[in-house]
């Protein structure tokens, strides 16, 4: 969480990022709330990039000021209008690339002061794995498969039962490129599996962890998934 | 006495969704998955998908993915099944049964008849 | 997917017959369910994990198997036994049934 204050003439307001990550290829939003003022057109979100010199995107008077917006950001962004009067400044950004991450800041004016706060934005891809018992082998086996990763993850499996046991040696790990080049699809098989037991398959980078599970029964499996966003730092 | 109860009937149009119910009782609804499966007039069954009902979390046939959605309502015990995109192959009984035990329990099926 | 092949589609059988009903997956799956289907009606659950039988299930019927193929059998068909029987798998997504045998009076 970064909490910034504004220092000049009119008084300081509070403004609060949260570090966050965008899948690439898909929208993401960069998450900034201030202290709301009563009047709209009181209002001024700038979202400025380190390093680049047009603004991401601008927000006074009520609507969207563009004519300084960097080319890189054109068409891409938006601020959700019917909630800044309520202090919401955050900005949706359409087909995150990998380029977009950096530093940004949040800053804002309004009738009671400025204020600004930056945020980390980092990006990559991710995406949840399915389980599933792999029927193209002779003996039970168990295959996690996750369509889009980058940077290449790392991909561990743990079992309810043996707490603590290092599968390395019973599973097999690939990474496959994907069409466009950057993202890559993660598939990984564990042999030996045994009934009556809840395996996980935990796929991780530096920007997200997403964990398969399976519990294996006699009369049926079943499988769930979660995926959780690493270092989520508000400032 | 454990019931699974269904909703109605329902004849909807090419294109259309439909939406059915599966009320059950006489057991702790949290506790076990339910399932969904579908039988064409004459044909054999067809398993759509499966909801945990203590946290809404659902599994999916592939083939129907993007078009059968899974709910539950835990303060009334029902769950749901909502099919999109209705096509004159989707006719059939639709049927929501609770995760095998010793013992399983199913409703008593559902009728969508789809036709222009 | 795991593919389920029933043998035969459908047979006639007198009472008292013995009846054997296959099922044949395409991968193997440890285990195996059979259901019984009436006109009508919803299935039920008849043999779960291979051999047990469901409650309320008579002891004229069995099942046996492993891996890929598995068989349900009727010791002494009853007229109460004319029905569909399915077998099912929950070993692998997406769960499949097998098409159905049908079991008629000759």
């Known amino acids: 969480l970064i909490i910034g204050f504004g220092i000049s003439g009119r008084h300081s307001i509070t403004v609060t990022t949260v570090a966050s990550a965008g899948n690439i290829g898909e929208d993401g939003i960069l998450s900034c709330t201030f202290e709301p003022d009563i009047k709209l057109s009181d209002i001024v979100i700038q979202w400025l990039k380190e390093g680049v010199l047009g603004l991401v995107h601008e927000f006074k008077e009520g609507k969207d000021e563009l004519s300084e917006q960097d080319e890189m950001f054109r068409g891409r962004t938006a601020v959700f209008a019917d909630q800044v009067i309520v202090g919401n400044a955050s900005l949706r950004l359409k087909n995150v690339q990998l380029t977009d991450a950096g530093t940004y800041k949040c800053y804002i004016i309004t009738s009671k002061g400025k204020g600004n706060a930056n945020l980390e934005y980092k990006t990559g891809a991710f995406s949840m794995p399915e389980v599933n018992v792999d029927y193209n082998a002779s003996s039970e086996t168990l295959r996690c498969e996750a369509p889009r990763w980058f940077p290449q993850p790392t991909v561990v499996w743990a079992s309810q039962v043996d707490q603590g046991a290092n599968f390395s040696e019973v599973s097999n790990t690939s990474f496959e490129l994907n069409s466009e080049n950057v993202t890559m699809k993660v598939v990984s098989v564990l042999y030996n599996v045994t009934i009556n037991n809840t395996y996980s398959c935990m796929i991780e980078n530096d920007i997200a962890k997403a964990t398969g599970d399976i519990k294996v029964t006699e009369s049926e499996i079943k499988r769930r998934s979660h995926l959780q966003l690493l270092n989520s730092k508000a400032s | 006495e454990v019931q699974l109860v269904q909703s109605g009937a329902e004849v909807k149009k090419p294109g259309a969704s439909v939406k059915v119910s599966c009320k059950a009782s006489?057991?702790?609804?949290?506790?076990?998955?339910i399932h969904w499966v579908r039988q064409a007039p004459g044909q054999g069954l067809e398993w759509i998908g499966e909801?945990?009902?203590?946290?809404?979390?659902?599994n999916y046939n592939q083939k129907f993915k993007g078009r059968a959605t899974l709910t539950v309502d835990t303060s009334t015990s029902t769950a749901y099944l909502e099919l999109s995109s209705l096509r004159s192959e989707d006719t059939a009984v639709y049927y929501c049964?609770?995760?095998?035990?010793?013992?399983?329990?199913w409703g008593q099926g559902t009728l969508v008849t789809v036709s222009s | 997917d795991i593919q389920m092949t029933q043998s035969p589609s459908s047979l006639s059988a007198s009472v008292g017959d013995r009846v054997t009903i296959t099922c044949s997956a395409t991968?193997?799956?440890?285990?195996m369910h059979w259901y019984q289907q009436k006109p009508g009606k919803a299935p039920k659950l008849w043999i779960y994990?291979?051999?047990k039988l469901a409650h309320g299930v008579p002891s004229r019927f069995s099942g046996s198997g492993s891996g890929t193929d598995f068989t349900l059998t009727i010791s002494s068909l009853q007229p109460e036994d004319f029905a569909t029987y399915y077998c099912?798998?929950?070993?692998?997504?997406?769960?499949?049934f097998g098409q159905g045998t049908k079991v008629e009076i000759k």
């Open positions: 909801i945990d009902p203590s946290d809404s979390y659902t």
């Open positions: 991968s193997s799956i440890s285990y």
């Open positions: 049964s609770r995760e095998i035990t010793t013992v399983d329990y």
């Open positions: 099912h798998q929950r070993r692998s997504y997406p769960f499949t």
């Open positions: 994990d291979t051999s």
């Open positions: 006489g057991y702790t609804f949290t506790n076990f998955w």
